[in-house]
Interface confidence: low
Amino acid sequence: DPVLCFTQYEESSGKCKGLLGGGVSVEDCCLNTAFAYQKRSGGLCQPCRSPRWSLWSTWAPCSVTCSEGSQLRYRRCVGWNGQCSGKVAPGTLEWQLQACEDQQCCPEMGGWSGWGPWEPCSVTCSKGTRTRRRACNHPAPKCGGHCPGQAQESEACDTQQVCPTHGAWATWGPWTPCSASCHGGPHEPKETRSRKCSAPEPSQKPPGKPCPGLAYEQRRCTGLPPCPVAGGWGPWGPVSPCPVTCGLGQTMEQRTCNHPVPQHGGPFCAGDATRTHICNTAVPCPVDGEWDSWGEWSPCIRRNMKSISCQEIPGQQSRGRTCRGRKFDGHRCAGQQQDIRHCYSIQHCPLKGSWSEWSTWGLCMPPCGPNPTRARQRLCTPLLPKYPPTVSMVEGQGEKNVTFWGRPLPRCEELQGQKLVVEEKRPCLHVPACKDPEEEEL
């Protein structure tokens, strides 16, 4: 007879898997011993391998649910073309039977006691139910038995009382506008909304419960710009060290506008970021020396000659100066203390002279006295002899300038009865008073 041929046999379940097709003979299907076959769809699956016993099935349930019974299990000879041990043909079942006991004793029914009293009504107002109970103990059931029927029964009850109405909140109202236009100020901006206990209102007779919770709530406003923060001065910093090593100096303290830093357009700190103080080292400052003005030139002389006056003989003369005022390790005066030059002496020499042009007008004298006048002069100016202007004193030292020195005796023709000086005087006009400018300011 033709069979259904499968490519697999599942040992654990005994099922055929992977249908190859139908209408073939057992012999053709079992050319591959890994295959399996069924004589009809849903029928027993037999593997093509040589026959052997399947695994034992699980034990069937015990034949009774209480006291001692028995239970069966089986195995099957599965395979083709041969026999299982014991010369059993494929498809044959082998059985095992054993004693079993699910529960030692069998349940026995119990009996009810009488009904107990009715419990109070389930509600304190309007209509409800009331209940009474009985016990399963006349007699008590045995071995898991029970009493037939219900352990409690209920009936309607009426309290004859009107029920109170408890309050419930209506929906929240809208949020109020923000209490400020910016955040971060002394009062954080908030918006508030409220609701009414009116959905429904609590009854007064009998009194209903008020609504639970709050009638309003607040929250902070979001999306607002930050409030301007005015700057505040931090503490004064340390006093800077005295910048001088002697005498008086000036020290400084600084502070920063960061307590707080101005923010969001707030104003900067008012006032100064620095303040100064006088500091005193109590150490006198060094005073550098300063040259006095040069002294007079010494007479123009030449060593080993008694006089060179009125002669074309160069001499030498010197002048000195003093370094004054140096104190407290101040600098010494720079430069030479003595100055030497070459000279021709015209001291008391009679020289031909000529009258000079008028000098410029001098200052008004006396400046603060009565009737000040100014003067100008013409002088009898000597004509200096044409001596060489330079000399070479020592070989290799180059040319040295030679200067005329001394007060000659110039000789001019008389002018307005004068031989040396002609003077002209004029009064000064519109003379202002001498006043101390400091006193004038006061």
Epitope: H183, G184, P186, H187, E188, K190, G213, L214, E217, Q218, R219, R220
Partner: nanobody
Framework: EVQLVESGGGLVQPGGSLRLSCAAS????????MAWVRQAPGKQRELVSE???????VYADSVKGRFTISRDNSKNTLYLQMNSLRAEDTAVYYC?????????????WGQGTLVTVSS
């Protein structure tokens, strides 16, 4: 003074979850509102969610249904459970507390915790 310390940020893949915590200390009895605020790179701070003292919650439209704010008063801690995270949730998340007393209010901020959503 109120001190706020955030934790729980990190790197997570799109669709993943994170739970941020904010531990509050100091004068916490006068806190009336707490909030989570985030700031993405180059953008302004944006309110994510807030919770009032009585438990009222508010969420930004962009996080509704994905984020849950809660607070544990016994631990003085604020939480933000973030589910179904998206790349646009990448930001520094700040914990914010609003303190209000008779003499005035103050805004307190944590140092922030970075949340990065990236595959």
């Amino acid at each position: 003074e109120v001190q706020l310390v955030e934790s729980g940020g990190g790197l997570v893949q799109p669709g993943g979850s994170l739970r941020l915590s904010c531990a509050a200390s100091g004068r916490i009895s006068s806190i009336i509102h707490m909030a989570w605020v985030r700031q993405a790179p180059g953008k302004q701070r944006e309110l994510v969610s807030e919770i009032s003292r009585v438990g009222t919650t508010v969420y930004a439209d962009s996080v509704k249904g994905r984020f849950t704010i809660s607070r544990d008063n016994s631990k003085n801690t604020l939480y933000l459970q973030m589910n179904s995270l998206r790349a646009e949730d990448t930001a520094v998340y700040y914990c914010n507390a609003l303190q209000y007393e008779k003499h005035g209010g103050a805004d307190y901020w944590g140092q922030g915790t970075l949340v990065t959503v990236s595959s």
